[in-house]
């Protein structure tokens, strides 16, 4: 796969993942009422990071925001923080990667600068994806713990026995947002890795040029970049196509040096 394709695909995958992270963060269904083995209620509860909602069988849905910071569980705060950090890093990653894209020409930016920017955006995407995956996993772990605690309470007699009035414990299970978050985090991570791989292909490799230059000249003369236009084919105006026959040409080939990773 060419550097441009790898970089472009990495960018697109990261972008999709990033959009998914935003969607997951905003979604209300992080946890949903467990309907299995529960009395059938005409009310369905679900909760997000920012508000909790109740949908009645009447069709009426009411959502209430968590208007307190201090009263919220520390774990929920931590998950919020991780998702926001993931989004912020993703935004920066996208901005950096736009300028780093090989198919986009910006002034006289050379490949080494683009390589650095590609690597930076790749790392940002990787961290963003990891933040999302950790955030979602922490929330899922919290749900599992609470679920089994609720189950234990339900079967230990706290739900009411004998002549006592029964109360129903609302148990929560994984909501759609968790799955969106896991997939989105994974995509962002994969996209970031692809950007990092593309970065290797953008990095100029001087030793490669010397070897090619030495054999092509046939003369025992020290290599000077651009000094043997006629015999080496390394003139400043020549294009990669002359060395890599049939190779694809990118828009900024005039500025870029050929490397052994260009057409992997």
């Amino acid at each position: 796969m060419s550097v441009t394709a790898c970089q472009g695909l990495g960018f697109v995958v990261s972008l999709i993942g990033f959009a998914g992270i935003i969607a997951a963060t905003c979604m209300d269904q992080w946890s949903t009422q467990d309907l299995y083995n529960n009395p059938v209620t005409a009310v369905f509860n679900y909760q997000g990071l920012w508000r909790s909602c109740v949908r009645e069988s009447s069709g009426f849905t009411e959502c209430r925001g968590y208007f307190t910071l201090l009263g919220l569980p520390a774990m929920l705060q931590a998950v919020r923080a991780l998702m926001i950090v993931g989004i912020v890093l993703g935004v920066i990653g996208i901005l950096v990667s736009i300028f780093a894209l090989k198919c986009i020409r910006i002034g006289s930016m050379d490949d080494s600068a683009k390589a650095k920017m590609t690597l930076t955006s790749g790392i940002l995407f990787i961290i963003s994806g990891i933040c999302a995956i950790i955030g979602v996993s922490v929330f899922a772990n919290m749900l599992v713990t609470n679920f089994w605690m609720s189950t234990a309470n339900m079967y230990s007699g706290m739900g009411g026995m004998g002549g006592m009035v029964q109360t129903v414990q609302t148990r929560y299970t994984f909501g759609a947002a968790l799955f969106v978050g896991w997939v989105a985090g994974g995509l962002t991570l994969i996209g970031g890795v692809m950007m990092c791989i593309a970065c290797r292909g953008l990095t100029p490799d001087d030793s490669n040029f010397k070897a090619v230059s030495y054999h092509a000249s046939g003369q025992n003369v020290a290599y000077r970049p651009g000094g043997f236009k006629a015999s080496t084919g390394f003139g400043s105006n020549t294009r990669n196509k002359k060395i890599y026959d049939g190779g694809a040409r990118t828009e900024d080939d005039e500025q870029s040096h050929p490397t052994k990773y260009d057409y992997v």
Partner: antibody, heavy 118, light 113 residues
Framework: QVQLVQSGAEVKKPGSSVKVSCKAS????????IEWVRQAPGQGLEWMGL????????NYNEKFKGRVTITADESTSTAYMELSSLRSEDTAVYYC???????????WGQGTLVTVSS | DIVMTQSPDSLAVSLGERATINCKSS????????????LAWYQQKPGQPPKLLIY???TRESGVPDRFSGSGSGTDFTLTISSLQAEDVAVYYC?????????FGQGTKLEIK
């Protein structure tokens, strides 16, 4: 304004079936559940089941499962309740009602008296 | 099924006096998600369908006089008519709106003393 108009009174033989209709007007029929409730003479109210006219989804009281069928026709904004294998104890006024906030029943049909007699 | 038990079965109150009807459910009707109790109160006069008075245990339906009020939470609920009027003579029902199948209390007949 919301209106639910039910079909007329029926006299049925034991073992037969009855189908009561409930025509809705004044609101988006497919957006609200229609519930069916019955009341035997001098007795209390008994919930029979519901239908979501938009999806066709139903939920029945176990007591009537297998005997009651609730359907809806969106084109005519009409809900139907069919009760089969009628017995004398099924003699009652059958009401349709539209669901409201809190799953309560704010709008009711005028009621349909079904008499089961041999 | 959820059992709804109303008390008393019948009640005679003088005009202008306070009338109180109680309703007890066999399970809590409180939904923790929105802190609302899914209980409704209906008034039924002879030959008429029931009329919704109160939903969410304490929210008065529009058009219902403010002398009607609902209170309670969990399993114990109360319908109060602060000043009984002649037109309030009817049978009153409470209803579980939380669990399927929805169930009604047996009814309380309110009369004028």
């Amino acid at each position: 304004q919301v209106q639910l108009v039910q079909s007329g009174a029926e006299v049925k033989k034991p073992g037969s079936s009855v189908k009561v209709s409930c025509k809705a007007s004044g609101y988006a029929f497919s957006n609200y559940l229609i519930e069916w409730v019955r009341q035997a003479p001098g007795q209390g109210l008994e919930w029979m089941g519901l239908i979501n006219p938009g999806s066709g989804g139903t939920n029945y009281n176990e007591k009537f499962k297998g005997r009651v069928t609730i359907t809806a026709d969106e084109s005519t904004s009409t809900a139907y309740m069919e009760l089969s294998s009628l017995r004398s104890e099924d003699t009652a006024v059958y009401y349709c009602a539209r669901v409201y906030y809190g799953n309560s029943f704010a709008y009711w049909g005028q009621g349909t008296l079904v008499t089961v007699s041999s | 099924d959820i059992v709804m038990t109303q008390s008393p079965d019948s009640l005679a109150v003088s005009l202008g006096e306070r009338a109180t009807i109680n309703c007890k459910s066999s399970q809590s009707l409180l939904n923790s998600g929105n802190n609302k109790n899914y209980l409704a109160w209906y008034q039924q006069k002879p030959g008429q369908p029931p009329k919704l008075l109160i939903y969410w245990a304490s929210t008065r339906e529009s058009g219902v006089p403010d002398r009607f009020s609902g209170s309670g939470s969990g399993t114990d609920f109360t319908l109060t008519i602060s000043s009984l009027q002649a037109e309030d003579v009817a049978v009153y029902y409470c209803q579980n709106d939380y669990f399927y199948p929805f169930t009604f209390g047996q009814g309380t007949k309110l009369e004028i003393k």
